[in-house]
Amino acid sequence: LNTTILTPNGNEDTTADFFLTTMPTDSLSVSTLPLPEVQCFVFNVEYMNCTWNSSSEPQPTNLTLHYWYKNSDNDKVQKCSHYLFSEEITSGCQLQKKEIHLYQTFVVQLQDPREPRRQATQMLKLQNLVIPWAPENLTLHKLSESQLELNWNNRFLNHCLEHLVQYRTDWDHSWTEQSVDYRHKFSLPSVDGQKRYTFRVRSRFNPLCGSAQHWSEWSHPIHWGSNTSKENPFLFALEA
């Protein structure tokens, strides 16, 4: 199973292959190569992938991952039971739904099994790392001669999501966008019947249940107007 590793975001300090840690003089720790950062995403609260850049290691190394939850009934250290691989080297760990506890501090530890003192421990707030599936079943209703309403569904608790609707006509060079709260419906009050419109939606786990920064993928687009409006002036649903 190959995985795609998200690339760094241009921080100039991360370009070096390694650094020597400069610890206070009374430290017992030895200078060691740093381990790669672990990045976790919770996909629709169905599973979680925690990945790292295995190619940042000076030589191919099967790093191991352990995790636990701080101050909870789930504070027992767990070994990763489902590793992800990149070119036959461990590059991530996949956790299943029963192992995900959104509102407890998630602690993840990466370790070099050949040098056990070489380890890095991170803490994560999983509720800020949720990425929902893209919205589905987009439908358009003509409420009046000039007003359209767009509806969609999410495979998740609807009140936890905010949405971003984008639309444009065939005459537009760019999208117009509108934020929508958990109600997952959007009205366009003034529609030009001579134009063909395209709509799409994406969703985010924010702000009621978490503070995620990452949006879902865009939905499949749905179109209205021009030819399609003649077929059924009152309803047009996306055909997958």
């Epitope: 998200l6 760094p8 975001n9 921080n11 100039e12 300090d13 991360t14 650094f19 840690t21 400069t22 610890m23 430290s27 720790s29 060691t32 740093p34 381990l35 950062e37 672990v38 990045q39 976790c40 602690v107 530890q109 003192r117 070489r118 380890q119 890095a120 421990t121 991170q122 803490m123 994560l124 707030k125 800020n128 790392l129 920064q213």
Partner: nanobody, 126 residues
């Protein structure tokens, strides 16, 4: 290179407050994971408060609800507000920083930090 300099330590009575500051020079901290650690005589260094540059902050159990981490990227400084201090809080307090690629990275392991200050002594008398 980043230089970190702590200040604000001192002697305080139990129940009192102190505010530690950590000033950075040489590079902006806006994309650094930062941490406050402490080391009491004869004990291992332990994390007190850690923070990702995305704003996720975590505290050690022993200080939760009493200590508050904050950062001011414009001033290139981080702070540790310490309230309701107890004798067990007596230690040398260190500020540490690590450049990170991801906004969510917060390290509780001291060996993950690249840069360290020289430390500031905090003594809480009973």
């Amino acid at each position: 290179q980043v230089q970190l300099v702590e200040s604000g330590g001192g002697l305080v009575q139990a129940g009192g407050s102190l505010r530690l500051s950590c000033a950075a020079s040489g590079r902006t901290l806006s994309r650094y994971a930062m941490g406050w650690f402490r080391q009491a005589p004869g004990k291992e260094r332990e994390y007190v408060a850690i923070d990702s540059w995305g704003g996720d902050t975590f505290y050690a159990d022993s200080v939760e609800g009493r200590f508050t981490f904050s950062r001011d990227n414009a001033k290139n400084e981080v702070y540790l507000q310490m309230n309701s201090l107890q004798p067990e809080d007596t230690a040398v307090y260190y500020c540490a920083g690590a450049p990170t690629s991801f906004a969510t990275t917060a390290y509780s392991s001291s060996n993950s930090y690249r840069y360290w200050g020289q430390g500031t002594q905090v003594t809480v008398s009973s």
